[in-house]
Structure formats: structure tokens, C-alpha cells
Interface confidence: low
């Protein structure tokens, strides 16, 4: 991707991180969320990225031969889901505060929550245009990654934001990758 720029939604961020602009020839992008399992707890976070952060990305899409006429604006979900005492106003901050421990915080990650489908036009060097239908991220959330530490005193389920009811396969596509396809 060319001309990639990212701005931060400051209500959720401590330190900016650029958007993740990787792509392959079919415009498929897998987002790397903020799942953070640290053997050393929080001691590495002197230059910490905290919170499930919504990074606003502006980029031009290219399939190798053609480039989008106008830039695509979307969110990139990044960062770490750290303990609520550290993050009083992060995304998902209302869930199960009293149960949150440093240990359990390591079992959450920042993932795509809401998406929308839109069409973009790519201008080709030979003068022709191509239209792609793509899915862009519009919101992020913290999601539990594992149940391996399900101690009875930790009601992890109560902290999970409700999932939107969608067709199973569409929900998978929307929440697990940014899917780009030829229309």
C-alpha cells in the first residue's frame, strides 16, 4: 500500500503505532491484534502500548497493477488489553472490573468488532478501472483468548462483550480478517 497514514483516537491510546499495511496480491489482510501473553507480566511496559486501541488508517489500495483513486479510511485494532485499574476508560472497560487481575488480563486481545462492506475503484496504468468489494473495520473490542486459567473466582464470561448475531460464516469473515474480493 502506498501513502499509508495513521491517526490515533486518543481516548484509547497512550502511544501511537502505525497501521498494519501488509497485503498480498488478492488484497487480503490479516490484522494482528493486541493479544499479549507476557512471561514477565507488566515489567516490559516502560514504553507500553496500552488498551484496545482504534488506530484510524488512511491508505491507498493496490493489487499490483492498479491503485485506488481515493484513499481508504478504516480502523486498525491494535494494542493490549491490560488491567482495568491501569485503563479506566478503554474499550470494554465496563466489563467485570472486580474480577480483573494481572494474570487474567493476559488472556485478552484486541480484535475487530464491527465491520462494513464498501466498494472501491482502482485506476489501472492502461486507463481501465477495477472495482473491488472490501470489508473495513469500524470498531474494535477486547476479546478473551483462552480459558486455560478459568479459576472459579474469575467469571471470565461475564466480561465478554456480547457478539452481534450474524450468519456464522459472515461473522467469522467480519471479525477475523479484512476480506477483499473482486466484485
Amino acid at each position: 500500500f502506498k501513502n499509508d497514514a495513521t491517526e490515533i483516537l486518543y481516548s484509547h491510546v497512550v502511544k501511537p503505532v502505525p497501521a498494519h499495511p501488509s497485503s498480498n496480491s488478492t488484497l487480503n489482510q490479516a490484522r494482528n491484534g493486541g493479544r499479549h501473553f507476557s512471561n514477565t507480566g507488566l515489567d516490559r511496559n516502560t514504553r507500553v502500548q496500552v488498551g484496545c486501541r482504534e488506530l484510524r488508517s488512511t491508505k491507498y489500495i493496490s493489487d499490483g497493477q492498479c491503485t485506488s483513486i481515493s484513499p481508504l479510511k478504516e480502523l486498525v485494532c491494535a494494542g493490549e488489553c491490560l488491567p482495568l485499574p491501569v485503563l479506566p476508560n478503554w474499550i470494554g472497560g465496563g466489563y467485570g472490573t472486580k474480577y480483573w487481575s494481572r494474570r487474567s488480563s493476559q488472556e485478552w486481545r484486541c480484535v475487530n468488532d464491527k465491520t462494513r462492506t464498501q466498494r472501491i475503484q482502482l485506476q489501472c496504468q492502461d486507463g481501465s478501472t477495477r472495482t473491488y468489494k472490501i470489508t473495513v473495520v469500524t470498531a474494535c473490542k477486547c476479546k478473551r483468548y483462552t480459558r486455560q486459567h478459568n479459576e472459579s473466582s474469575h467469571n471470565f464470561e461475564s466480561m465478554s462483550p456480547a457478539k452481534p448475531v450474524q450468519h456464522h460464516r459472515e461473522r467469522k469473515r467480519a471479525s477475523k480478517s479484512s476480506k477483499h474480493s473482486m466484485s
Epitope: 498494519h20 490484522r31 493486541g34 507476557s38 483468548y145 477475523k176
Partner: antibody
Framework: QVQLVQSGAEVKKPGSSVKVSCKAS????????ISWVRQAPGQGLEWMGW????????RYNRKFTGRVTITADESTSTAYMELSSLRSEDTAVYYC???????????WGQGTLVTVSS | DIQMTQSPLSLSASVGDRVAITCRAS??????LNWYQQKPGKPPKIVIY???GLPSGVPSRFSGGGSGTDFTLVISTLQPEDFATYYC?????????FGGGTKVEIS
């Protein structure tokens, strides 16, 4: 296009250490998880651990705890895997792999053969 | 740790055949199951993610199904380039674990 390029093959003595590098290009390194997966000759795949490049946060497979150290250098977009106290059963191809959003490996390095022999 | 058990260990098939490989997890992993194809001397390649998601660029003859503990990878019409070893992998909890692999050979 995302690419992971690993360092070359190594021959090591039992008891020594090996450090394999994995240079990433074509993406934002700081917001990615790099895992290390090994494969002994004729055997299956074994996950060793991962690093979240933005913070250096790591998670290791208990089997390797104390012997494996995964690090990352943001300035060069390179991840490293160091395995110590090598034994013959550590002879394997070591892969670095970059995870997608929910724990599947979207991109892989070409692999580095580490041979442990006296 | 979650154990992943694949079956069969190997299978012989012909071009055009329908092939199914199963993977069983030692505990429920929801839909956090991925399938990889590996050819000799090459790194694995993702063919199905999240139990049934088809990555861009992977032919539609590959499909995945299942949830909880039992999963299936199906190749509807086997092609010459599909002869390889296939691995399942759970991404539900660390340590991430793989099945032992299923080698699809030419009969």
C-alpha cells in the same frame, strides 16, 4: 507483500546455543506477533513461543521454558529465537511465522535447519 | 495443554477424488481450528482458518467444518498439486498445538 527471511543453516555441538533470525518486511512490525515453530526431520510441527513485537511481550511453550529466548529488534524489524543447551533431538527446521488476527499463521519464513551433532 | 489428534495418518487417493481428514481436540476449542498444507522442503501454508474460513487465494475445493472438539478438512475434487501433508492447529489457548499430520499420497 509481506516476507519473512530467516538466517542460514547452522551446525552446532551438543550443549551449545543457536540464535536464528527472522527479518520481516512489507508490514508494520511493531503490531505483529511472530511465533517460532520447529519441525524435526520427518516429524510434525511444534510451537515454541511467540513475541509481540511492539512491547517485547513473550509467551513460551512450557516444554522449552528456560532454554528458549525470543526477542525482537524493532529498528531492524527482526525477530530472534535463541535455543540453549542443545541436544541431538533439537535437530530440526526452525520456522518463524507471523500470525493473523486470531492465531493462525498467515506468513512463514523459509525455515532454518539447525543440526546438532558432536 | 490441548492435544490435537488427526486421522488418518496417511491416505492414498487419485486425482478427482473427494478427500476428508479429521482432527479431534482433547477439549472444546470452539471454532479456533486452522488447517495447513505442507509440501516437502517448504513451510506450511494456511488453507482453512477458524474452522471454515477460506483464505484469499486458496481454491474453493478446500472446505472446513466442525466446532467444539471435532473438525473436518474436505478437498472436494483432489488435484495433482494437493498431494501434501495436512496439519490441524488449535489457536484457542497457548501453547498452540498441532495435529500429527495427514499425508495425502497418490494411489
Amino acid at each position: 507483500q509481506v516476507q519473512l527471511v530467516q538466517s542460514g543453516a547452522e551446525v552446532k555441538k551438543p550443549g551449545s546455543s543457536v540464535k536464528v533470525s527472522c527479518k520481516a518486511s512489507g508490514g508494520t512490525f511493531s503490531s505483529t506477533y511472530i511465533s517460532w515453530v520447529r519441525q524435526a526431520p520427518g516429524q510434525g510441527l511444534e510451537w515454541m513461543g511467540w513475541i509481540y513485537a511492539g512491547t517485547g511481550g513473550t509467551r513460551y511453550n512450557r516444554k522449552f521454558t528456560g532454554r528458549v529466548t525470543i526477542t525482537a529488534d524493532e529498528s531492524t524489524s527482526t525477530a530472534y529465537m535463541e535455543l540453549s543447551s542443545l541436544r541431538s533431538e533439537d535437530t530440526a527446521v526452525y520456522y518463524c511465522a507471523r500470525e493473523g488476527v486470531d492465531g493462525w499463521f498467515t506468513y512463514w519464513g523459509q525455515g532454518t535447519l539447525v543440526t546438532v551433532s558432536s | 495443554d490441548i492435544q490435537m489428534t488427526q486421522s488418518p495418518l496417511s491416505l492414498s487417493a487419485s486425482v478427482g477424488d473427494r478427500v476428508a481428514i479429521t482432527c479431534r481436540a482433547s477439549q472444546s476449542i470452539s471454532d479456533s481450528l486452522n488447517w495447513y498444507q505442507q509440501k516437502p522442503g517448504k513451510p506450511p501454508k494456511i488453507v482453512i482458518y477458524a474452522a471454515s474460513g477460506l483464505p484469499s487465494g486458496v481454491p474453493s475445493r478446500f472446505s472446513g467444518g466442525g466446532s467444539g472438539t471435532d473438525f473436518t478438512l474436505v478437498i472436494s475434487t483432489l488435484q495433482p498439486e494437493d498431494f501434501a501433508t495436512y496439519y490441524c492447529q488449535q489457536s484457542y489457548s497457548a501453547p498452540l498445538t498441532f495435529g500429527g499430520g495427514t499425508k495425502v499420497e497418490i494411489s
